[in-house]
């Protein structure tokens, strides 16, 4: 029950996170004009990954796309790439995790397959979240660098009389959305990985002796397994995730990826 809840919560948290990453990537407010020196500006500038906008006090907003690839800063391109990779990985992770959900029955999919898929989606969410956090952090670092550079030459005198104010940019709402969304996706991924470990049914760890009617053959099996007494639940459809130990009915089953997590 706790595993299902953990898996379900991980899925929901990741879903919210990825939606946030998509929203942040599409948002225009990655950087917004710093109003410290001119709080009563009638023209407000803000920029996104894909276009820059100007909002006038009149209410009129004009946005212009960056219709060039080669002319854009390498850092901006890197941020775009990180965010897109994050979205793609997150989307695939969501798709995989839907089929991995314990509450959803798909044919005769075994728990081991679901555990595998849960782990895969968890790792994807973790990488997706890290991509988003990295992308947003790179952009934020770029902003901080540019902010102090423009502060250094904020006012350039012209004839001693006229001053040209250089527009400075500070953190926009999209950065905070991106950080939070990346964090949520990361947390969701971790929850999926945790859920994966407990996705297999709880097995009683007996280090036991198997007594048979003949009284001759004594089977001692090291490691976690169910004593093969013939009593208890049918083990035919159960797999034990304990570093490769197998029930007698499952001689041909092989350890999965997540055995080593």
């Amino acid at each position: 029950m706790a595993v299902t809840a953990c898996q379900g919560l991980g899925f929901v948290v990741s879903l919210i996170g990825i939606a946030g990453i998509i929203a942040a990537t599409c948002m225009d407010q990655w950087s917004t004009q710093d109003l410290y020196n001119n709080p009563v500006t009638a023209v407000f500038n803000y920029q996104g990954l894909w276009r820059s906008c100007v909002r006038e006090s009149s209410g009129f907003t004009e946005c212009r796309g960056y219709f060039t690839l080669l002319g854009l800063p390498a850092m901006l391109q890197a941020v775009r790439a990180l965010m897109i990779v994050g979205i793609v990985l997150g989307a695939i992770g969501l798709l995989v995790s839907i089929f991995a959900l314990k509450c959803i029955r798909i044919g005769s999919m075994e728990d081991s397959a679901k555990a595998n898929m849960t782990l895969t989606s968890g790792i994807m969410f973790i990488v997706s979240g890290l991509c988003a956090i990295a992308g947003v952090s790179v952009f934020a670092n770029m902003l901080v660098t540019n902010f102090w550079m423009s502060t250094a030459n904020m006012y350039t005198g012209m004839g001693g009389m006229v001053q040209t104010v250089q527009t400075r940019y500070t953190f926009g709402a999209a950065l905070f959305v991106g950080w939070v969304a990346g964090g949520l996706t990361l947390i969701g991924g971790v929850m999926m990985c945790i859920a994966c470990r407990g996705l297999a049914p709880e097995e009683t760890n007996y280090k036991a002796v198997s007594y048979h009617a003949s009284g001759h053959s004594v089977a001692y099996k090291p490691g976690g397994f169910k004593a093969s007494t013939g009593f208890g639940s049918n083990t035919k459809n159960k797999k034990i995730y304990d570093g490769g130990a197998r029930t007698e009915d499952e001689v041909q089953s092989y350890p999965s990826k997540h055995d080593y997590v």
Epitope: A42, C53, S57, S58, G59, F60, T164
Partner: antibody, heavy 118, light 113 residues
Framework: DVQLVESGGGLVQPGGSLRLSCAAS????????MHWVRQAPGKGLEWVAF????????YYADSVKGRFSISRDNAKNTLFLQMNSLRAEDTAVYYC???????????WGQGTLVTVSS | DVVMTQSPDSLAVSLGERATINCKSS????????????LTWYQQKPGQPPKLLIY???TRESGVPDRFSGSGSGTDFTLTISSLQAEDVAVYYC?????????FGQGTKLEIK
Amino acid sequence: DVQLVESGGGLVQPGGSLRLSCAASGFTFSSFGMHWVRQAPGKGLEWVAFISSGSHTIYYADSVKGRFSISRDNAKNTLFLQMNSLRAEDTAVYYCARFQYGNSFDYWGQGTLVTVSS
Amino acid sequence: DVVMTQSPDSLAVSLGERATINCKSSQSLLNSGNQKNYLTWYQQKPGQPPKLLIYWASTRESGVPDRFSGSGSGTDFTLTISSLQAEDVAVYYCQNTYSFPLTFGQGTKLEIK
């Protein structure tokens, strides 16, 4: 056709109050920021106050700050200017103007004269 | 506050001749975000409210004759009437529309010589 009609002007004593109105028609009033601009007799134009379309943003000229108050009623398509503690230097023709792209004033009313005199 | 200074205060030009009015701002009115200059020109005839001529320093308002043109960038701007007509007699104002307060120039009175 866009129309802006000011009213409420008149003669008032120094220290007195007056409330100007600007009735708008011919456009979606609630979508536009509005301004009050004044012009003293024989003088140039002086910007007085601004109110955004939803009344979220309001700015005043330093000369009227604390004495004048701009407001609007979008349901009645009307702009207001409440003028308190009036001084002789507030004597002017008061215009309301519509804010358009480029932060320009594309339509102006005919103006209403406010005379502050004892 | 941005101080707007117009020159000359008054100007007399013959009909059909070119009239040029200058406007200088104490701060740059060029917005880096869209590379537009936030300067507006108005025409005011006696007994009438002002009329919008040009915004963004060089964009003519619809209905304004093409003999009116605006130019300049940053802090120095010019309004040019290529061929003066009798109906162009008026006072012309430039206005800072970049930051509040939205200050006006003192005005330039244009007359026929």
